[in-house]
């Protein structure tokens, strides 16, 4: 359960201070220095290729 007033981001996303909204952590692979990537706990899995 989240504490009152915490960022309402779901698993796999992180709050962007610049955009004032939650962003998908998967995009941090391409743009790792985006502000919200600081809040992405684990590296997203590499895309599966045959």
């Amino acid at each position: 359960e989240q504490a009152p007033g915490t960022a309402p981001c779901s698993r796999g996303s992180s709050w962007s201070a610049d955009l004032d909204k939650c962003m998908d952590c998967a995009s941090c692979r391409a743009a790792p220095h985006s502000d919200f990537c600081l809040g992405c706990a684990a590296a997203p899995p590499a895309p599966f290729r045959l």
Partner: antibody
Framework: QVQLVQSGGGLVKPGGSLRLSCAAS????????MSWVRQAPGKGLEWVSA????????YYADSVKGRFTISRDNPKNTLYLQMNSLRAEDTAVYYC?????????????WGQGTLVTVSS | LTQSPGTLSLSPGERATLSCRAS?????LTWYQQKPGQAPRLLIY???SRATGIPNRFSGSGSGTDFTLTITRLEPEDFAVYYC?????????FGGGTKVEIT
């Protein structure tokens, strides 16, 4: 209990190098971003650097970019700050801190601080 | 981030109002307390949410570029330096601090 224990400070000559360490315990280290903040004697707080939980994203203040490197060893629950090309103005107490992304990037747990003195 | 006043001289029981002004619009602000020889302590996050264990005499408010930390009735242990902090453009930034001292 949740704590951060720092080590590695000391006296270094201008142009020299030093590595600070911050050992974390009492929480799942990989789940949190971490940061370094410094405070020159008698001055205010200055953010230095931050790193994501995975270590894949790093951030630096302009004043240290290209000279300092933040890193983390998640299996060892340890955060590092490698400081190169040190200058007199880098003299400060350095703190490591846990960053809470869901607290809008507030820092809720702090180390005890370690003094870095750059002087000839 | 610009904090004002630089020093606030008050007596225990009085109300303290600390200001933090940003040069550009900020979505959320954080406040810390620091006592001499100690590490900073998180007080307020997300502009107005109190951190764990922080008494309700501390409150934060504001939006855009103007933010305020209010201490309704100063206790002896509240005399310290207070810092605001933002996260913008992938940079964490602190204000210069406001010292709340006993008059």
């Amino acid at each position: 209990q949740v704590q951060l224990v720092q080590s590695g400070g000391g006296l270094v000559k201008p142009g020299g190098s030093l590595r600070l360490s911050c050992a974390a315990s009492g929480f799942t280290f990989t789940s949190y971003a971490m940061s370094w903040v410094r405070q020159a004697p008698g001055k205010g707080l200055e953010w230095v650097s931050a790193i994501s939980g995975s270590g894949g994203s790093t951030y630096y203040a302009d004043s240290v970019k290209g000279r300092f490197t933040i890193s983390r060893d998640n299996p060892k629950n340890t955060l590092y700050l490698q400081m190169n090309s040190l200058r007199a103005e880098d003299t400060a107490v350095y703190y490591c801190a846990r960053v809470r992304a869901n607290y809008y990037y507030g820092m809720d747990v702090w180390g005890q601080g370690t003094l870095v003195t750059v002087s000839s | 981030l610009t904090q004002s006043p630089g020093t606030l001289s008050l007596s225990p029981g009085e109300r303290a109002t600390l200001s933090c002004r940003a040069s550009q619009s900020v979505s959320r602000l954080t406040w810390y307390q620091q006592k001499p020889g100690q590490a900073p302590r998180l007080l307020i996050y997300g502009t107005s949410s109190r951190a764990t264990g922080i008494p309700n005499r501390f409150s934060g408010s504001g939006s855009g570029t103007d933010f305020t930390l209010t201490i309704t009735r100063l206790e002896p242990e509240d005399f310290a330096v207070y810092y605001c902090q933002q996260f913008r453009n992938s940079l964490l930034t602190f204000g210069g601090g406001t010292k709340v001292e006993i008059t």
